[in-house]
Each structure stands twice: as structure tokens, then as C-alpha cells.
């Protein structure tokens, strides 16, 4: 057993039939000896009496608020909650296996640039008595600062028969340099609390490893004189790091039409222009990397041909 | 320690075409490396990131761009000394600010060509002969060596008397390889940002 | 399966002019960019030029800008090379290529010999 | 016109060797550059696109990188299959260029 937070308690449980469980001690935050009783959530039934309460744990019906009174006044809280290991592996029936970029991803995060601000997100069915709390830093055996907010709700999607609800929350390194090389990686720390199901869930990354720039901006076009071709030309978004000559980006532009299966046109290049072909009904896009570090590419900027 | 807005220098150029050549270079290597030694720790995640050249030279800060010098945690330089002549250096003018920035890149690829040059004799030595160093890297080092023209002592070629432990060998190499394109990356973007100024 | 066929070798004489097919099979040429690239014996390969069968657009090599006309029937999955005002220069091998890509060239018909006699 | 510049112009090779092949542009072209083989009598095929990118049914063997104006097509233990000429091809602008070729032959 550990404490979470103030009175709130996380009993870890091998979770097999028959598991003998865990027996717990919880202790009345008072300085009265006598006349204690103890109750659970909203029962009256008295457990037991005296300033300790032992109990065996053993699933979800021994978890929740444990509540020691004196005399028909509350004295204190105990928030059991349960962890469980099946098979030698945490439970991780709260968030959604996102599955990318491999299996077992729950976690997912993102930097738009090299500033040390990140988002990470996860995906979960549940839409009540949901809690989570985040933490993160910079390595782990000598921990540097990384400061998060609170995670909130971002998106709500239906998937079949099911909603989805997706979480994030932002990130930012207290003293992070653009042109650092990172040695040590950024830890994130997710608990994740539903109704008296406790889990954990981390991430570790690079910043390098999870840039991913947002869109150019101002794409514009210029048909050239007696000829299909058209030059696009666009800008650096503006969250990108500066200066844009020490954090590059390198660029595809694509022509295609409306279905993915049709013909298309496409060039890279470093350049904040280029010259394509243009089609009837196609559109133009154009999408940005890191020129130097291969990382995700950004979404498409798109501007429709005609 | 850091770079100014420099006048436009033609003797960047050829730095600037070997450093993007060197970054291809060493991650090509890098990738066959993690393609030969599948079965050995040799991603991202797995290996443990050390910088041979930490506390010896100081490329980072010394080739800070400008803009980045207000910012306070990218001040934390260590003083080190170099020695300052370089032919990517075409301009009288040119700082002494970049003549520092320019030789520990220089002392930097003199560092990791021994270590390379070291480890390929190891893995020459491997009956299994599963790995070998890629010559057009070393020949890359060498030649944006040459490029950046700094004088300095030559390292000696470590020698191991004992008999090398080829999997300890491979590990290492990942290592090295995994922290040697992380400087190229810098490389290349410190003569791209040159370049342009 | 996603093939080319091209009409058979030819021989002509000297400033005459040739008309050169390939026929697609398997997909519809439409839905593709058409290129022609000429192979002269023993040495590299020239790219013609490109048309769009779904617009006739085409766009070709300054080189070959007056001496080859491409033309694309879409009734027939069928794209043309005309080649005019024929001399020794113009022995080669003529290949067809369908792409859904317009700058690269992923499917290759096996080419039409066109010897040009004096 | 984007000229490009394969060397060497003939390489000799034994079964089982490693080989670089090499392709030079005048002018960068970003990763605008795919490589072809073609074998004795036959068109061509396509076996790197966008200088690194592998195409489905060319054996692994194949891998190309490079960008800017150098590139390298390399093959990792040469087949017998193998031998023939092989061409870059940018695709950074029209007019399309192809090199001079390389010829892979029997030592």
C-alpha cells in the first residue's frame, strides 16, 4: 500500500481467483483512543472500533472511503483504491491501446518545436468517475523539471457503438535550449483513476523524436505563362523554432485529386516554392518536416487548384 | 560563445555540402546498423546515450545561433579552448566567435574518427564479420575535416592488447552511432545557419 | 495485371514519319499519366514528354518539342508517338510507361525498335 | 537541364560483393531522384523512388540514400540476377533527366 495523495491509498493486488489479498492497516487521524467506530462509503454498517481498522483487500467491494467517527462526528478518511497485477502485468483496462506507432501505446505526444512544450493524449470509452493527474520530467534518477497542466477533456468521437473521449494535457521543460541535444529522455507520468480502479500509465520520448511542425501557412499560387505548371510558395508556420536557417524544414508538395487512388503529382523540396502540374478538380498540397532530424511530418496545407 | 550574423562567406559552401553529406552518411550507417544487429539493443529506446565528447569540446554553445543567446538556459557553456584558423573561413573578418564554433566541430569529428577507426579494426577481427564501418563515412569525416582546415594534435589510435568483446563492441557502436548523428544533426544545422548569414 | 502492350519494330525511311502505339490492359489510361522515353542503341534513355489521356495536356522535352506529337484515345486504352521528319538520330528504342505518379516511371511497356534507313 | 553524372561508368563484380553506385546532380534536387535497372533486352524497372524509398517486389538487397546532389544506390551481396545497367532519374524538374548509366558486370 501507498499513498497517492493526501488520505487517498493505492493497494496493489495480484488479481487471480482465490488470491489471498492484501491485509491493510488504516489508522484514525485523531488523537481521541476511545470510542472510534468505522464505517465504508455511504453504509452505516460499523466495521470495526478502535483507533486501528485491519482488513483483508481483496477486490473491489474492500475498496472505497473508510470513514472513522467518534460519538456521530466524522474524525477523518481513508480512500482505498486497487491496483491490479494480473499475471505479472499492471492492468490497463482505463485507456485505449492506440496501437501507434506500435502496440501497447497509450500514451501519445507531440512538440510543434523545439521549445520544450509538448501535448500528449489518450483515448478511453469511459465518460464518468474518471480522474487523472500528470506528471513529468526530464530523466529519472536525477529528475529535471517539466511542468504540466491540468488534463482536460479534448475531443469526443463515436466509434460503432461507442463513444470515444480523448484526454491531452501541455507540457513545457522549466529550462529547455531549442539547440540542446538531448541525452536524457522526458518522462510522463499519467495516474488514471476510475471509480476504485487505480493505473498508471508512462511515456518516454525525445523531443527530437516527437516534433512534428505545424502546416506551412500562405500557400498561394502563380500559374506560369503558356503552361500547366503553377508555382506554389508558402511560409514557414509560425510556431516552427527560429532562426529558420538553424531549424530548417524541408517540404512535399502534392497534386491529387479527390480519391487517394488517382493520379497524382509530387516533388520535394527545401525551398519555400515550387512548380507543379495542376489538374481540373485537383488541389494543391504541401506538407513540412525537421530538414536534418527525420521526424512526423506535418498535415497537409491545401489549396484547391483552380 | 555563440555565432553573429556573419557576411555572406563563400568559404562556407563546401562545409555546408560535407556536413549534409556527413549527417546522410552517418544515418545510413546508423539504419544498417539496426537492420544487422536486429537482435541487439541498438534502437533509440534501447542503448544508453553518452556523448564522448561531453566536457572535452562544447559545439553547441559555442555555435549558438544569435537569436538563442537571450535565452538563459542555453548559456550554460563550458569554457574550452581551440585553436582558430580554418579554410571554411574565406573572410578576414570572420569572428572569432565561429573560429571556436568551427574547431570543436572539428575536434569533435577528430574524436569520433578514432573512436570509429578503433572499433573498425575490432570489428575486423570477428569471425562472424556481421558489421563493418561504412568507408564512405569515415571518407565524409575525413573530408569535412579537411574542409574546416583547423591545425591540431593528432590523437593516436587506441590499441587493445586484450582480446575485443565483439558484443560489448556492436553495443557500442550503436552507441556511438546513435550520439554521433545527433551532432551531425547540429553540424548541419550550424553550417546551414552559417550559410545563410 | 497492369501492362503495356506496344506496337511491333518498324523500319522507315529516311524523312518519312511513324506512328507508334501502346495499349493498356488492366486499368484504364485515364486514371493515368502517359510518358514516352526513347533508348538509342546501346546508350542512356531520354524522356520524351508526358500527356494526361483524361485532358490530352501533354508537356514535352525541348528536345523533342516539333518532332514528337503524343495523342491519347481513351475509347480504345490506347496512347500514340508520332514521330515526324525521321533521320539516323531517331533509331532507338521507343518505351511507353503508364504512371500514377507524373515523375517517375513504375510500369514500362517492352518498347518498339523503330530503325530509320537512309 | 538538371544533368546528372553516374560513376563509375562500368563495375566489375564477383557474386556475394557489395557494391555503391553513385549519382551526381548539377543542381540540388532535394530527394527528387529514383533509381532503375535494367537487365540485357529488357525495359527498364523501377527499383528506389525519392532516393531511399523501396518498392514492393525489389528484393531488399536494394536501398538507396542520398539527397541534395549525392546520391548512392547500394546493393548489399550481388545476385547474378543483378548484373546489368543501372540509371538515376530526377524528378525535380521538366524537362526529366536520366544519367549515363552504370554497368554492373561479371568480374
Known amino acids: 500500500i501507498w499513498e497517492l495523495k493526501k488520505d487517498v491509498y493505492v493497494v496493489e493486488l495480484d488479481w487471480y481467483p482465490d488470491a489471498p489479498g492484501e491485509m491493510v492497516v488504516l489508522t484514525c487521524d485523531t488523537p481521541e483512543e476511545d470510542g472510534i467506530t468505522w464505517t465504508l462509503d455511504q453504509s452505516s454498517e460499523v466495521l470495526g472500533s478502535g483507533k486501528t481498522l485491519t482488513i483483508q483487500v481483496k477486490e473491489f467491494g474492500d475498496a472505497g472511503q473508510y470513514t472513522c467517527h467518534k460519538g456521530g462526528e466524522v474524525l477523518s478518511h481513508s480512500l482505498l483504491l486497487l491496483h491490479k497485477k494480473e499475471d505479472g502485468i499492471w492492468s490497463t483496462d482505463i485507456l485505449k491501446d492506440q496501437k501507434e506507432p506500435k502496440n501497447k501505446t497509450f500514451l501519445r505526444c507531440e512538440a510543434k518545436n523545439y521549445s520544450g512544450r509538448f501535448t500528449c493524449w489518450w483515448l478511453t470509452t469511459i465518460s464518468t468517475d474518471l480522474t487523472f493527474s500528470v506528471k513529468s520530467s526530464r530523466g529519472s534518477s536525477d529528475p529535471q523539471g517539466v511542468t504540466c497542466g491540468a488534463a482536460t477533456l479534448s475531443a469526443e468521437r463515436v466509434r460503432g457503438d461507442n463513444k470515444e473521449y480523448e484526454y491531452s494535457v501541455e507540457c513545457q521543460e522549466d529550462s529547455a535550449c531549442p539547440a540542446a541535444e538531448e541525452s536524457l529522455p522526458i518522462e510522463v507520468m499519467v495516474d488514471a483513476v476510475h471509480k476504485l480502479k487505480y493505473e498508471n500509465y508512462t511515456s518516454s520520448f525525445f523531443i527530437r523524436d516527437i516534433i512534428k511542425p505545424d502546416p506551412p501557412k500562405n500557400l498561394q499560387l502563380k500559374p506560369l505563362k503558356n503552361s500547366r505548371q503553377v508555382e506554389v510558395s508558402w511560409e514557414y508556420p509560425d510556431t516552427w523554432s527560429t532562426p529558420h536557417s538553424y531549424f530548417s524544414l524541408t517540404f512535399c508538395v502534392q497534386v491529387q485529386g479527390k480519391s487517394k487512388r488517382e493520379k497524382k503529382d509530387r516533388v520535394f523540396t527545401d525551398k519555400t516554392s515550387a512548380t507543379v502540374i495542376c489538374r481540373k478538380n485537383a488541389s494543391i498540397s504541401v506538407r513540412a518536416q525537421d530538414r536534418y532530424y527525420s521526424s512526423s511530418w506535418s498535415e497537409w496545407a491545401s489549396v484547391p487548384c483552380s | 560563445r555563440n555565432l553573429p550574423v556573419a557576411t555572406p562567406d563563400p568559404g562556407m559552401f563546401p562545409c555546408l555540402h560535407h556536413s549534409q553529406n556527413l549527417l546522410r552518411a552517418v544515418s545510413n550507417m546508423l539504419q544498417k546498423a539496426r537492420q544487422t544487429l536486429e537482435f541487439y539493443p541498438c534502437t533509440s529506446e534501447e542503448i544508453d546515450h553518452e556523448d564522448i565528447t561531453k566536457d572535452k569540446t562544447s559545439t553547441v554553445e559555442a555555435c549558438l545561433p544569435l537569436e538563442l543567446t537571450k535565452n538563459e538556459s542555453c548559456l550554460n557553456s563550458r569554457e574550452t579552448s581551440f585553436i582558430t584558423n580554418g579554410s571554411c573561413l574565406a573572410s578576414r573578418k570572420t569572428s572569432f566567435m565561429m573560429a571556436l564554433c568551427l574547431s570543436s566541430i572539428y575536434e569533435d569529428l577528430k574524436m569520433y574518427q578514432v573512436e570509429f577507426k578503433t572499433m573498425n579494426a575490432k570489428l575486423l577481427m570477428d569471425p562472424k564479420r556481421q558489421i563493418f564501418l561504412d568507408q564512405n563515412m569515415l571518407a565524409v569525416i575525413d573530408e569535412l575535416m579537411q574542409a574546416l582546415n583547423f591545425n591540431s594534435e593528432t590523437v593516436p589510435q587506441k590499441s587493445s592488447l586484450e582480446e575485443p568483446d565483439f558484443y560489448k563492441t556492436k553495443i557500442k557502436l550503436c552507441i556511438l552511432l546513435h550520439a554521433f548523428r545527433i551532432r551531425a544533426v547540429t553540424i548541419d544545422r550550424v553550417m546551414s545557419y552559417l550559410n545563410a548569414s | 495485371e497492369v501492362q503495356l502492350q506496344q506496337s511491333g519494330a518498324d523500319l522507315v525511311r529516311s524523312g518519312a514519319s511513324i506512328k507508334l502505339s501502346c495499349t493498356a490492359s488492366g486499368f484504364n489510361i485515364k486514371d493515368y499519366y502517359m510518358h514516352w522515353v526513347k533508348q538509342r542503341p546501346e546508350q542512356g534513355l531520354e524522356w520524351i514528354g508526358w500527356i494526361d489521356p483524361e485532358n490530352g495536356d501533354t508537356e514535352y522535352a525541348p528536345k523533342f518539342q516539333g518532332k514528337a506529337t503524343m495523342t491519347a484515345d481513351t475509347s480504345s486504352n490506347t496512347a500514340y508517338l508520332q514521330l515526324s521528319s525521321l533521320t539516323s538520330e531517331d533509331t532507338a528504342v521507343y518505351y511507353c510507361?503508364?504512371?500514377?505518379?507524373?515523375?517517375?516511371?513504375?510500369?514500362w511497356g517492352a518498347g518498339t525498335t523503330v530503325t530509320v534507313s537512309s | 537541364d538538371i544533368v546528372l553524372t553516374q560513376s563509375p561508368a562500368t563495375l566489375s563484380v564477383t557474386p556475394g560483393d557489395s557494391v555503391s553506385l553513385s549519382c551526381r546532380a548539377s543542381q540540388s534536387i532535394s530527394i527528387n531522384l529514383h533509381w532503375y535497372q535494367q537487365k540485357s533486352h529488357e525495359s527498364p524497372r523501377l527499383l528506389i523512388k525519392f532516393a531511399s524509398q523501396s518498392i514492393s517486389g525489389i528484393p531488399s538487397r536494394f536501398s538507396g540514400y542520398g539527397s541534395g546532389t549525392d546520391f548512392t544506390l547500394s546493393i548489399n551481396s550481388v545476385e547474378t540476377e543483378d548484373f546489368g545497367r543501372y540509371f538515376c532519374?530526377?524528378?525535380?524538374?521538366?524537362?526529366?533527366?536520366f544519367g549515363a548509366g552504370t554497368k554492373l558486370e561479371l568480374k
Open positions: 532519374q530526377q524528378s525535380n524538374s521538366f524537362p526529366l533527366t
Open positions: 510507361n503508364a504512371c500514377k505518379e507524373l515523375r517517375y516511371f513504375d510500369v
